[in-house]
Interface confidence: medium
């Protein structure tokens, strides 16, 4: 079979929350992407930010390949990670307001994933191995959530290490692409 990047083949696995692989050292060089792989549109900027509301909870995007051992996605995926503090934006510059808002004994507002998206990706493997279709779970949006000192452990656990380690964010996934298209590292797959 041909190994077109824009084909419809392979299996999918969704990594557990918080078990996503670290992005590779090098970010994607957009110039290497051909039109079929990229749909004619440039990928998101590596660290493009977007304010979600008056709270400074930001959605950061970066581009990376998804890998599973020697196999790599035919095209990169755009990961979304949640970042920023969650006091009202107008209070953040104010030391008093911030101090009051972030009192250790008071409520803790965290910027955490709100919605997830299951993204299908096609993995291409070396040595003539069959391509694989994999499914990765990616953050689709972020929100500020109020956590208390009594339940922040369990609440954060629900989101894996996303809140604690935003650098491990994920990107929303398309579902209709070739079964050969993308995959994420599967040490966290289930």
């Amino acid at each position: 079979q041909g190994w077109q990047a824009f084909k419809n083949d392979a299996t999918e696995i969704i990594p557990e929350l918080g078990e996503y692989p670290e992005p590779p050292p090098e970010l994607e060089n957009n110039k290497t992407m051909n039109r079929a792989e990229n749909g004619g549109r440039p990928p998101h900027h590596p660290f493009e930010t977007k304010d979600v509301s008056e709270y400074s909870c930001r959605e950061l995007h970066f581009t990376r390949y998804v890998t599973d051992g020697p196999c790599r996605s035919a095209k990169p995926v755009t990961e979304l990670v949640c970042s920023g503090q969650c006091g009202p934006a107008r209070l953040l510059p104010n030391a008093i307001g911030r101090g009051k808002w972030w009192r250790p004994s008071g409520p803790d507002f965290r910027c955490i994933p709100d919605r997830y998206r299951a993204q299908r990706v096609q993995l291409l493997c070396p040595g003539g191995e069959a391509p694989r279709a994999r499914k990765v779970r990616l953050v689709a949006s972020c929100k500020c959530k109020r956590l208390t000192r009594f339940h922040n452990q369990s609440e954060l656990k629900d989101f894996g290490t996303e809140a604690a380690r935003p650098q491990k964010g994920r990107k929303p996934r398309p579902r209709a692409r070739s079964a050969k298209a993308n995959q994420a590292e599967l040490e966290n797959a289930y």
């Epitope: 299996t11 999918e12 969704i14 996934r173 398309p174 209709a176 692409r177 079964a179």
Partner: antibody, heavy 117, light 111 residues
Framework: QVQLLQPGAELVKPGASVKLSCKAS????????MHWVKQRPGQGLEWIGE????????DYNENFKSKATLTVDKSSSTAYMQLSSLTSEDSAVYYC??????????WGQGTSVTVSS | DIVLTQSPASLAVSLGQRATISCKAS??????????MNWYQQKPGQPPKLLIY???NLESGIPARFSGSGSGTDFTLNIHPVEEEDAATYYC?????????FGGGTKLELK
């Protein structure tokens, strides 16, 4: 060539269960998700769910979560769908289909399930 | 769930003419530069056959008279020139979001 073989028909009684099979050949069974689709007589297509043969992971359409159970037997490259508590609403043709990243590229011929006493 | 609305429900086209089928999604099926819309052909007593995937990509073995276009929420399947063997029901299907959903179908008949 890729083939998905399904039995032609099943006749079952109301309230009973039935286990449909789909034997795959011509490709690496564990490299593609297997989907199941329902089509009632003269009607459109409904996606039931999918299973990843490499690890048994399943994803279901909420409408079928209490109706269908998907499994696979890797040793025989066969996917199964069990339908439970059958009623006349379950009378339909059920297709298995190989799933890629974008679409279902190969389909079985379908198994016609008739629920009748 | 994403709802796909196909139109027309049926159409009659003369041999050699163009058949155009529309599919509108209740929300965008685009993601990261790709459109997760597919088209299938189904004849009576047969399973569906994949024609077009990712909005505009022709599946292997499918004649070039079939073409797909569109993005976001509006998609089109074109058949030109229509041949006798094209009489069938055509379905659009989105795979951008679970559950995968299908349009209601368009029955193509020959005049």
């Amino acid at each position: 060539q890729v083939q998905l073989l399904q039995p032609g028909a099943e006749l079952v009684k109301p309230g009973a269960s039935v286990k449909l099979s789909c034997k795959a050949s011509g490709y690496t069974f564990t490299s593609y998700w297997m989907h199941w689709v329902k089509q009632r007589p003269g009607q459109g297509l409904e996606w039931i769910g999918e299973i990843n043969p490499s690890n048994g992971r399943t994803d279901y359409n909420e409408n079928f979560k209490s109706k269908a159970t998907l499994t696979v037997d890797k040793s025989s490259s066969t996917a199964y769908m069990q339908l439970s508590s059958l009623t006349s609403e379950d009378s339909a043709v059920y297709y298995c289909a190989r799933g890629g990243v974008y679409a279902m590229d190969y389909w079985g011929q379908g198994t016609s399930v008739t629920v009748s006493s | 769930d994403i709802v796909l609305t196909q139109s027309p429900a049926s159409l009659a086209v003369s041999l050699g003419q163009r058949a155009t089928i529309s599919c509108k999604a209740s929300q965008s099926v685009d993601y990261d530069g790709d459109s997760y819309m597919n088209w299938y052909q189904q004849k009576p007593g047969q399973p569906p056959k994949l024609l077009i995937y990712a909005a505009s990509n022709l599946e292997s073995g499918i004649p070039a008279r079939f073409s797909g276009s569109g993005s976001g929420t509006d998609f089109t399947l074109n058949i030109h020139p229509v041949e006798e063997e094209d009489a069938a029901t055509y379905y659009c299907q989105q795979s951008n979001e679970d559950p995968w959903t299908f349009g209601g179908g368009t029955k193509l008949e020959l005049k």
